[in-house]
């Protein structure tokens, strides 16, 4: 499969915003690209979100995706919003190269999101 | 329209070598990785091995089963994939197959070793 | 090496019946795999990419699902010409790119 690059862990903001880049080496030249973001608890895979995109375009997720990112050359940018303290876990992200055959897959080693809760602001009396 | 065509199969003795061939056409041979897969008489299919492509520095892969006597190279100028079968074994008779990714698949060559 | 097991070895089915076959993975393989048809006497051919995807050309009756370590290869309304045997293989890296068993079908 293809090497798949991606940061070891990140940090959410105090929004529940985490960013990360997603960098794929292509042995050929797709035109075609889906990039998958799964999440990993034990042995359970889920799937966060997915977009397909032609190189030179912009990556689109659906409307209701907890997901936007933009695409340049062999390097995807990923924003998963909407975190919470419970969503901290392990985010793999999986490239397929969908067109022209032949079908390429590569899996990354996966980013581990940290996701703390922001504490409640305490009541002011002025 | 996309063409692999295996050659170099036969009949050989054990612990003799012979060099199968793969000549492909009709797709961008260079992009592909070269797989070769095996099914021996009246048994399921077996993945021998893998050459990936220039971007990949031509990384080389091999099933347990054949790693230390296979070899396979590629001449991408000729879109052609080999592979060198040495010390040969009764069990490495087989149909052998060469597949561009895994999209495209060969015909197949006949092995038969056996004294 | 992640194993793959497929099942059953063989079955018999009347055209128009659907059909199962189940492929597992001894670790999670995140929808690498393939299936491939094989007719009598002819090479495999690509059916099924990346679990899900069909392969160009592949009649629509032919499916695949499952994803982590559990995969499906449907045949909605099983034909003559579908008298075959069919093999999934694990394409995740590092290899080896190991096939299932496979599983024969043929028509009642």
């Known amino acids: 499969a293809m090497h798949v690059a991606q940061p070891a862990v990140v940090l959410a903001s105090s929004r529940g915003i985490a960013s990360f880049v997603c960098e794929y080496a292509s042995p050929g030249k797709a035109t075609e690209v889906r990039v998958t973001v799964l999440r990993q608890a034990d042995s359970q895979v889920t799937e966060v979100c997915a977009a397909t995109y032609m190189m030179g375009n912009e990556l689109t997720f659906l409307d209701d995706s907890i997901c936007t990112g933009t695409s340049s050359g062999n390097q995807v940018n990923l924003t998963i919003q909407g975190l919470r303290a419970m969503d901290t876990g392990l985010y793999i992200c999986k490239v397929e190269l969908m067109y022209p055959p032949p079908y390429y897959l590569g899996i990354g080693n996966g980013t581990q999101i940290y996701v703390i809760d922001p504490e409640p602001c305490p009541d002011s009396d002025f | 329209e996309v063409q692999l065509v295996e050659s170099g199969g036969g009949l050989v003795q054990p612990g003799r070598s012979l060099r199968l061939s793969c000549t492909a056409s009709?797709?961008?041979?260079?992009?592909?990785?070269m797989n070769w897969v095996r099914q021996a008489p009246g048994k399921g299919l077996e993945w021998v091995g893998q050459?990936?492509?220039?971007?990949?520095?031509?990384?080389?892969y091999y099933s347990d089963s054949v790693k230390g006597r296979f070899t396979i190279s590629r001449d991408d100028s000729k879109s052609i994939a080999y592979l060198q079968m040495n010390s040969l074994k009764t069990e490495d008779t087989a149909v052998y197959y060469c597949?561009?990714?895994?999209?495209?698949w060969g015909q197949g060559t006949t092995v038969t070793v056996s004294s | 090496d992640i194993q793959m097991t497929q099942s059953p070895s063989s079955l018999s089915a009347s055209v128009g019946d659907r059909v199962t076959i189940t492929c597992g993975a001894s670790?999670?393989?995140?929808?690498?795999l393939n299936w491939y048809q094989q007719k009598p006497g002819k090479s495999p051919k690509l059916l099924i990419y990346?679990?899900?995807n069909l392969a160009d050309g592949v009649p629509s009756r032919f499916s695949g699902s499952g994803s982590g370590t559990d995969f499906t290869l449907t045949i909605s309304s099983l034909q003559p010409e579908d008298v075959a045997t069919y093999y999934c293989?694990?394409?995740?890296?590092?290899?080896?790119?190991?096939f299932g068993g496979g599983t024969k079908v043929e028509i009642k």
């Open positions: 293989q694990k394409i995740l890296s590092p290899p080896p790119w190991t």
């Open positions: 990346g679990a899900t």
């Open positions: 050459i990936r492509n220039k971007p990949y520095n031509y990384e080389t």
């Open positions: 597949t561009g990714g895994m999209d495209y």
């Open positions: 009709g797709f961008t041979f260079s992009d592909n990785w």
């Open positions: 670790e999670i393989i995140y929808g690498a």
